[in-house]
């Protein structure tokens, strides 16, 4: 059924043209989970190609994916979430290539949202806060977040801070005065579940104030 060679030295005899990758999202719609797969080569002719998942499912042996443009998609409550599933690309009922995947190892969290930055004049710092839908979830509750910020004029000079909470303080003295900054955040699973970074949140832009000199202090 799997369509791949069982022999050790033939294990990579699958058709490379059909290599694909997938990610899962747990409780993405209420208690429904999703699984999204796509071919790594965007030029693959996907006409007549189907995806199917078998094994590690509740009550059913296999499920077929829906096709949405160039991606393949399942939304279901039927993932057992323990054990490996066999995900196959099929044409006319025949498997072209398959992968054994544990869906708990390919989790992609939802992007954080409501990112904002508030300047505290007295403390001379910036409080960064954001929200994540995962605080309400029952499975992927523990995340590591990556906050990235840059001065808008420095195209590729991103600074990164990793944190497990949804609040971060940036000290004013570590930022350039009177500058426009862009900041964004993404998340990755961080307890039992493994997988990929979420999409970035929408960026937030903030301006740092000019330096307030203390009385009697001269400008350089």
């Amino acid at each position: 059924e799997s369509g791949y060679a069982q022999n050790g030295d033939l294990e990579d005899a699958e058709l490379d043209d059909y290599s694909f990758s997938c990610y899962s999202q747990l409780e993405v719609n209420g208690s429904q989970h999703s699984l999204t797969c796509a071919f790594e080569d965007p030029d693959v002719n996907t006409t007549n190609l189907e995806f199917e998942i078998c094994g590690a499912l509740v009550e059913v042996k296999c499920l077929s994916f829906r096709k949405l443009q160039e991606i393949y998609f399942i939304e279901t409550k039927k993932f057992l979430l323990i054990g490996k599933s066999n995900i196959c690309v099929k044409v006319g009922g025949k498997s072209l290539t398959c992968k054994k995947i544990d869906l708990t190892t390919i989790v992609k969290p939802e992007a954080p949202f409501d990112l904002s930055v508030i300047y505290r004049e007295g403390a001379n710092d910036f409080v960064v806060t954001f929200n994540t839908s995962h605080l309400q979830k029952k499975y992927v509750k523990v995340l590591m977040h990556d906050v990235a910020y840059r001065q808008e004029k420095d195209e590729n000079k991103w600074m990164h801070v990793n944190l497990s909470s949804t609040k971060l303080t940036l000290l004013q003295r570590n930022l350039q005065p009177e500058a426009m900054y862009e900041i964004k955040v993404r998340s990755i699973p961080d307890h039992y579940f493994k997988g990929f970074w979420s999409e970035w949140s929408p960026s937030y832009y903030f301006r740092t104030p000019e330096i307030n000199n203390s009385p009697g202090e001269m400008d350089p």
Epitope: I82, K84, K100, D102, Y139, Y192
Partner: antibody, heavy 118, light 111 residues
């Protein structure tokens, strides 16, 4: 059928090293992680570590770090466990086991007895 | 490390009677409905054999007189009608956190 076949019993002197092999057959070698579990005489089971044959990535029980080295050879569908600086307490049956999921063991080798004695 | 405590240490049950083995963990091994507890049977001179994974899922080929239940820190393996071939040592194992630990074992005998 799915099988894990381990190398034969070994008798070693204290301070020596031993390398135990586990050959997989009946399934695609890179689809499943392989782990090692030991059982001292009359004792329970102790997870030592595991290896992902696809990537060569390893995970070790902290207790066995520096003592155990896991490797794999995709060309022969074989994983190896090397035990170094052997002591009498290392006398045990060593099992390789396939991980059917994270991390339970659905297929086991027959076991390899390692005896450490002067 | 998560400590798994099995009870009883040994159990003598008449043929056809129910055998119940408990496994208690030092911390939760559940994430919502995902229960990372597994059960094995080991007969003398043989490797362990997987019976139940994920607390309650029967491994393929295992007789349905074996069943598992439980969540969080308390789990149970039940043999509904003990057969002579069920004489063995039974182990629980958790896989929520490295190192993946086993219980000390419960020896099941015929009364």
């Amino acid at each position: 059928q799915v099988q894990l076949v381990q190398s034969g019993a070994e008798v070693k002197k204290p301070g020596a090293s031993v390398k135990v092999s586990c050959k997989a057959s009946g399934y695609r070698f890179t689809d499943y992680e392989l782990h090692w579990v030991r059982q001292a005489p009359g004792q329970g089971l102790e997870w030592m570590g595991g290896i992902d044959p696809k990537t060569g990535g390893t995970a070790y029980n902290q207790k066995f770090k520096g003592k155990v080295t896991l490797t794999s050879d995709r060309s022969t569908s074989t994983v190896y466990m090397e035990l170094s600086s052997l002591r009498s307490e290392d006398t045990a049956v060593y099992y390789c086991a396939r991980s059917g999921g994270r991390w339970y063991f659905d297929v086991w080798g027959q076991g390899t007895t390692v005896t450490v004695s002067s | 490390d998560i400590v798994l405590t099995q009870s009883p240490d040994s159990l003598a049950v008449s043929l056809g009677e129910r055998a119940t083995i408990n496994c208690r963990t030092s911390e939760s091994v559940s994430i919502h409905l995902l229960h990372l507890m597994h059960w094995y049977q080991q007969k003398p001179g043989q490797p362990p054999k997987l019976l139940i994974y994920g607390a309650s899922n029967l491994e393929s080929g295992v007789p349905d007189r074996f069943s598992g239940s439980g969540s969080e820190t308390d789990f149970t393996l039940t043999i509904s009608s003990l057969q002579a071939e069920d004489v063995a040592v039974y182990y629980c194992q958790q896989s929520i956190k490295d190192p993946y630990t086993f219980g000390g074992g419960t020896k099941v005998e015929i009364k």
